[in-house]
């Protein structure tokens, strides 16, 4: 079992040693300056009060300095994500100092004990930063702490204890258990750095959540609602990763935050955007695709500092792998029914045709229920950049497509047996691109033919009349 540690966070090495060295104590936290992109390279170990390694290892006092802080570990080894992140930081910021905070001895414990050690590790990082601040040209404003899971709260403590204010802290799916709902001084919070951005990827809304659910930064980003990440479903982990265990599924979702951050470093040309929204349900309904008043932002490394915001919840959809970027669209569809068939819940699909590419058949997800004789809002997203939208095809799935729909059809028939021929009228669809903020209105090809029934399709083209909205491009997208 792990070696005991003292209250000052020092690890007593009480192993097989000669008497003379029996009292030797070692710091429980090590700082490894990664001097090479080669993951096998041993790097340089820095320690407070010893300036020689800074010179020997070419520590750049004027450059950005990243501290990567791992979380709880069951194996006691650095996991594979770590050298991926180191490499990505070196690729993006060639002159930067990349320091790995090795607190493995204190993290390789029971989870509760590891949690109790976070404060001591935060203190160690703060002491290192205080010492570096004594050096000429070193600025705390250039320091970026990146903490994964439990490491995010370690970063919070470090930011809290340091003399001055750290430039930035990024929390990568900060740990939930023992941190959810606690006082701001005992977890990551916006007060811990000049800018605190957080990615939440495994926040279950029921039971024990591995990642913290509550917002803890200036901006808190919840990719895919912050819970079920594409590519991490049970079928995915059995199929593509061939992991096949619940723990690997958990790991996949929890670790996704790291990969989203790495993606933001290495795929600069494909930045992912998140949109401010009060909750995941509203986002899924397509209500929150606005970039006005700083309501959207890049995610990960490219996030723009928003000091005025606190605990601002932001959402986006992603792909299952790198590059994670998708293209979001809000569809506003006015559905009219002469039959007043209130229980009609059609299974609708849309295909978008663009100047660059065409989308797949995209489902219009009904988050609550479709309101008839009203405007319904939907969110759809594509993995490819379609370019300018030219036309679209709306399809109402027929009875034969699925057992679920067969049941729906049967239920609808029971509720209104006198009127089995259900029909909806849709004259136009208003589309807004989340990424470009452009709005376009599409009308049915033939104004006299705007009805659709199960198993049928309806084509829409850019409106020729005054329904076409002005093209508005947010200046935000130029920041990408």
């Amino acid at each position: 079992s792990p070696v005991p540690f003292g209250p000052e966070g020092r690890l007593e090495d009480k192993l097989h040693k000669p008497k003379a060295t029996q009292t030797e104590v070692k710091p429980s936290v090590r700082f490894n300056l990664r001097t090479s992109k080669d993951p096998e390279h041993e790097g340089c170990y820095l320690s407070v009060g010893h300036s020689q390694p800074l010179e020997d290892c070419s520590f750049n006092m004027t450059a950005k300095t990243f501290f990567i802080i791992h979380g709880w570990t069951m194996s006691g080894i650095f996991e594979n994500w770590l050298h991926k992140l180191v490499s990505a930081l070196h690729t993006r910021e060639k002159d930067a100092n990349v320091v790995v905070v090795d607190w493995l001895p204190l993290a390789h414990q029971l989870y509760t004990d590891a949690v109790n050690n976070t404060r001591v590790v935060g203190h160690s990082i703060a002491r290192m930063l205080d010492w570096l601040q004594e050096k000429d040209d070193f600025s705390l404003g250039n320091v970026h702490l990146i903490g994964y899971s439990l490491g995010a709260h370690v970063a919070g403590y470090a930011g809290n204890f340091v003399k001055g204010t750290v430039g930035r802290i990024t929390g990568l799916d900060p740990a939930g258990p023992m941190f959810e709902g606690v006082d701001i001084n005992r977890r990551l919070s916006p007060d811990d750095a000049d800018f605190v951005d957080v990615l939440h990827t495994y926040t279950l809304s029921f039971g024990l959540s591995i990642g913290i659910r509550m917002p803890v930064g200036h901006i808190d980003i919840y990719p895919n609602g912050g819970d079920f990440q594409p590519g991490c479903g049970f079928n995915d982990v059995i199929g593509s990763f061939a992991y096949g265990t619940i723990s690997e599924m958990v790991k996949c979702e929890h670790e996704r935050a790291v990969h989203l951050f790495v993606d933001s470093l290495v795929n600069q040309d494909k930045p992912s955007f998140a949109f401010q929204c009060t909750d995941s349900s509203r986002f899924k309904r397509g209500i929150c695709l606005s970039c006005r008043k700083n309501r959207c932002n890049n995610i990960g490394y490219n996030a723009k500092k928003m000091r005025k915001k606190r605990n601002s919840k932001m959402y986006l959809k992603t792909r299952a792998g790198m590059p994670f970027k998708v293209y979001h669209y809000q569809l506003k569809v006015h559905m009219f029914s002469y039959n007043n068939s209130g229980d009609t819940q059609p299974t609708l699909y849309i295909t978008l045709y663009g100047s660059n590419a065409d989308s797949q058949n995209l489902p219009l997800e009904i988050v609550e229920k479709i309101e008839l004789n009203a405007t319904n809002t939907f969110l759809v997203y594509t993995e490819e950049d379609l370019g300018d939208l030219l036309k679209m095809r709306l399809t109402w799935e027929g009875v034969a497509h699925s057992w679920y729909n067969l049941w729906n059809e049967f239920r609808n028939y029971l509720s209104q047996p006198s009127n089995p021929s259900r029909e909806l009228y849709i004259r136009r669809i208003r589309v807004k691109s989340g990424e470009t903020q452009r709005k376009v209105t599409f009308c049915t090809q033939d104004p006299t033919k705007s009805s659709i029934s199960p198993g049928q399709e309806l084509w829409f083209h850019k409106c020729q009349d005054g329904w076409k909205m002005k093209n508005k491009t947010s200046p935000f997208v130029n920041l990408a």
């Epitope: 792990p2 070696v3 690890l11 090495d13 009480k14 192993l15 070692k26 429980s28 090590r30 490894n32 990664r34 080669d38 993951p39 096998e40 390279h41 041993e42 790097g43 170990y45 069951m74 194996s75 006691g76 080894i77 650095f78 996991e79 594979n80 994500w81 770590l82 050298h83 991926k84 180191v86 790995v100 090795d102 493995l104 001895p105 390789h108 593509s240 990763f241 061939a242 992991y243 096949g244 990969h259 790495v262 790198m322």
Partner: antibody, heavy 120, light 112 residues
């Protein structure tokens, strides 16, 4: 140059204890983890576990929990494998091998091996 | 635990010909574009020696006639052209994230 030098062959009786050493040179001992690998006569390689040479925390695989103990003498850059209550099936060659903490955890340098024979 | 199955258990190859050894994992050993599969050579009375790391990277000092390929669950070690000194037992090993790390059963290569 980097070297891992292990102690010489051992002949033991069942129930006894053996302690095998692995002395490292040519690199900073505490900057790399140390593995132990067992190879029974005419058989393949079996990973026993590893020890964090900085913290001294050992990790054992399920088959090697109980009678086996990894330890260190950091000042002498030496790792130890101790096997208590020896059994006939412990007869094997034992290798130490280092790996990088930060990389892909392959074993880049190996000791020459220590042959242990357990026989009554 | 990830089980590695090597085939064939033994093979005899003529001098100058190609030797191909396969290693199949019970589940993927890939991680974010990297394969955590490594190959070792062991001669009688000697410790194993690292040949290939991360599926296809040649360890320094190893002759270029050794090459590795594969991803996911299927990996291959190729030796071409085979030389006399290549007679040995070859092992694959996976180190994908959390231990236990495991070795394949080994393939004995004889030179005809």
């Amino acid at each position: 140059q980097i070297q891992l030098v292990q102690s010489g062959p051992e002949l033991k009786k069942p129930g006894e204890t053996v302690k095998i050493s692995c002395k490292a040179s040519g690199y900073t001992f505490t900057n790399y983890g140390m593995n132990w690998v067992k190879q029974a006569p005419g058989k393949g390689l079996k990973w026993m576990g590893w020890i964090n040479t900085y913290s001294g925390v050992p990790t054992y695989t399920d088959d090697f929990k109980g009678r086996f103990a990894f330890s260190l003498e950091t000042s002498a850059s030496t790792a130890f494998l101790q096997i208590n209550n020896l059994k006939n099936e412990d007869t094997a060659t034992y290798f130490c091998a280092r790996f990088s903490y930060y990389g892909r955890h392959y074993f880049d340098y190996w000791g020459q091996g220590t042959t242990l024979t357990v026989s009554s | 635990d990830i089980v590695l199955t090597q085939s064939p258990a033994s093979l005899a190859v003529s001098l100058g010909q190609r030797a191909t050894i396969s290693c199949k994992a019970s589940q993927s050993v890939d991680y974010d574009g990297d394969s955590y599969m490594h190959w070792y050579q062991q001669k009688p009375g000697q410790p194993p020696k690292l040949l290939i790391y991360a599926a296809s990277n040649l360890e320094s000092g190893i002759p270029a006639r050794f090459s590795g390929s594969g991803s996911g669950t299927d990996f291959t070690l190729n030796i071409h052209p085979v030389e006399e000194e290549d007679a040995a037992t070859y092992y694959c090993q996976q180190t994908n994230d959390d231990p236990p790390w495991t070795f394949g059963g080994g393939t004995k290569l004889e030179i005809k």
